[in-house]
C-alpha cells in the first residue's frame, strides 16, 4: 500500500504542507508552515462559518426583513446562520425563506386539509359528498351535513359541497 499523498480529513494542502482547517465559527488568518500552526480567528458579531474551512472572511448572518413579512425564528451564532420565518398568517415563498406571502384561503366548497405553517401554504381539498364548506377560510375544514334524522326532522333541501342540508318537520299527514 502506498502512503497517503493526500492530507487528512480536517486538513488542506498549501505550499506542500498539510495544514489544519479552521473549525466552524473561525476564519483563516494565516496558513501553517512546517514550524507554525494554522492561525484562525473567531467570526465577529453577526457573522458565521458553519464548516471546517480556510475562508478568510466569515459570512454575514441572514437579515430577516420585516418589510418582507419576515421575523427571526432562530438567532444565528458564530457557527450557524440566522433562520427566518414568516409572520403569523404568512408563509415562505422558498426554502431559503427570503420573502413571505399571505396564506391561501380555501373557497366555499373546499375545506382545509392541512393548515399553513411558516414554511408551507394551506392545502385545500374539495368537500366530499356528505360534507360542505360555505366560507372562504384558511382554517375551516369541511363540515358534515346536518343529520336531520337525529333531530327527528326530515331533509327539506339537499345539501351541496357549499351548503348544508335544510331540515324541516315531518309531514304529519303521513302514516
Amino acid at each position: 500500500p502506498e502512503p497517503p499523498t493526500a492530507c487528512r480529513e480536517k486538513q488542506y494542502l498549501i505550499n506542500s504542507q498539510c495544514c489544519s482547517l479552521c473549525q466552524p465559527g473561525q476564519k483563516l488568518v494565516s496558513d501553517c508552515t512546517e514550524f507554525t500552526e494554522t492561525e484562525c480567528l473567531p467570526c465577529g458579531e453577526s457573522e458565521f462559518l458553519d464548516t471546517w474551512n480556510r475562508e478568510t472572511h466569515c459570512h454575514q448572518h441572514k437579515y430577516c426583513d420585516p418589510n418582507l413579512g419576515l421575523r427571526v425564528q432562530q438567532k444565528g451564532t458564530s457557527e450557524t446562520d440566522t433562520i427566518c420565518t414568516c409572520e403569523e398568517g404568512w408563509h415562505c415563498t422558498s426554502e431559503a425563506c427570503e420573502s413571505c406571502v399571505l396564506h391561501r384561503s380555501c373557497s366555499p366548497g373546499f375545506g382545509v386539509k392541512q393548515i399553513a405553517t411558516g414554511v408551507s401554504d394551506t392545502i385545500c381539498e374539495p368537500c366530499p359528498v356528505g360534507f360542505f364548506s360555505n366560507v372562504s377560510s384558511a382554517f375551516e375544514k369541511c363540515h358534515p351535513w346536518t343529520s336531520c334524522e337525529t333531530k327527528d326532522l326530515v331533509v327539506q333541501q339537499a345539501g351541496t359541497n357549499k351548503t348544508d342540508v335544510v331540515c324541516g318537520p315531518q309531514d304529519r299527514l303521513r302514516a
Partner: antibody
C-alpha cells in the same frame, strides 16, 4: 507554542487497567492525528497506533489490538490511551505524538513528555 | 509489516569524529524515512524527515541520505551533546515501525 502534556506516572498491579491522557494546546486538536508510542525500559520505540481526534477512528499495530483502547475528548483537546489486563512486561514509558504530513513525508513533529507505567505485584 | 534494521546497535566514538548510522527497510519505502534523536529520560526529537530533509533548528552537522531500502544518517563532527541514541522510522505504511536504535557512547 504547541504542547502535549501527559498525565503522571502510574503504578499498577497485573490484571489492572491504566488510562494515560495527553492534553494538546497551541493548535486545532481535531486537525491532526495523534499517535501513541511505547518504550520499555532500556528498549527501543514501538508504534502502537493512531486516533483521528475528529471522528474517533483508530488504527492499531496488531500486537496492541484488543487490549488497547484509544479515545479522545475534543471539548478539552485531550487524547487517551488505555491498556487493559496489564502484565509485568507492559512496564514502559508511553508517549503521545502529533502527526505532521507534508508532500515529501510524514513524521512526528511534537511529542508528549512521556508517562511511565510500572506494572508490579 | 516492514522491518527496520539499524546498524550498528551501539558504537564508541570521540568528539570530532565522523559518524555514519545505517537503516535498512525490509521493502521499498521510497523516502518515507525519519531520523530521531533521544536523550536519556526525554522524548525523541525529529532530526530529519523524508530521508534527507533537515528539520529547521537542527545543526547542519546532521545529514541524511538514501531511498528505497537503504538509508544513512551522518554526523560530520560529533559533539558532546550527540552521545545519545538515534532511531530511524518508516511511515510508508502502517504499522509504522522504528529501527531498534543506535546508542552512541564516548570512546
Amino acid at each position: 507554542q504547541v504542547q502535549l502534556v501527559q498525565s503522571g506516572a502510574e503504578v499498577k498491579k497485573p490484571g489492572a487497567s491504566v488510562k494515560v491522557s495527553c492534553k494538546a494546546s497551541g493548535y486545532t486538536f481535531a486537525g491532526y492525528y495523534m499517535h501513541w508510542v511505547r518504550q520499555a525500559p532500556g528498549q527501543g520505540l514501538e508504534w502502537m497506533g493512531w486516533i483521528n481526534p475528529d471522528s474517533g477512528g483508530t488504527n492499531f499495530a496488531q500486537q496492541f489490538q484488543g487490549r488497547v483502547t484509544m479515545t479522545r475528548d475534543t471539548s478539552i483537546s485531550t487524547a487517551y490511551m488505555e491498556v487493559s489486563r496489564l502484565r509485568s512486561d507492559d512496564t514502559a514509558v508511553f508517549y503521545c505524538a502529533r502527526e505532521k504530513i507534508t508532500m515529501t513525508g510524514i513524521y512526528f513533529d511534537y511529542w508528549g513528555q512521556g508517562t511511565l507505567v510500572t506494572v508490579s505485584s | 509489516d516492514i522491518q527496520m534494521t539499524q546498524s550498528p546497535s551501539s558504537l564508541s566514538a570521540s568528539v570530532g569524529d565522523i559518524l555514519t548510522i545505517t537503516c535498512r527497510a525490509s521493502q521499498n519505502i521510497t523516502t518515507y524515512l525519519n531520523w530521531y534523536q533521544q536523550k536519556p529520560g526525554k522524548a525523541p526529537n525529529l532530526l530529519i524527515s523524508a530521508a534527507s530533509r533537515l528539520r529547521s533548528g537542527v545543526p547542519s552537522r546532521f545529514s541524511g541520505s538514501g531511498s528505497g531500502t537503504d538509508f544513512t544518517l551522518t554526523i560530520s563532527s560529533l559533539q558532546p551533546v550527540d552521545f545519545t541514541t538515534f532511531y530511524c522510522q518508516q511511515t510508508f505504511t502502517t504499522p509504522w515501525t522504528f529501527g531498534q536504535g543506535t546508542k552512541v557512547e564516548i570512546k
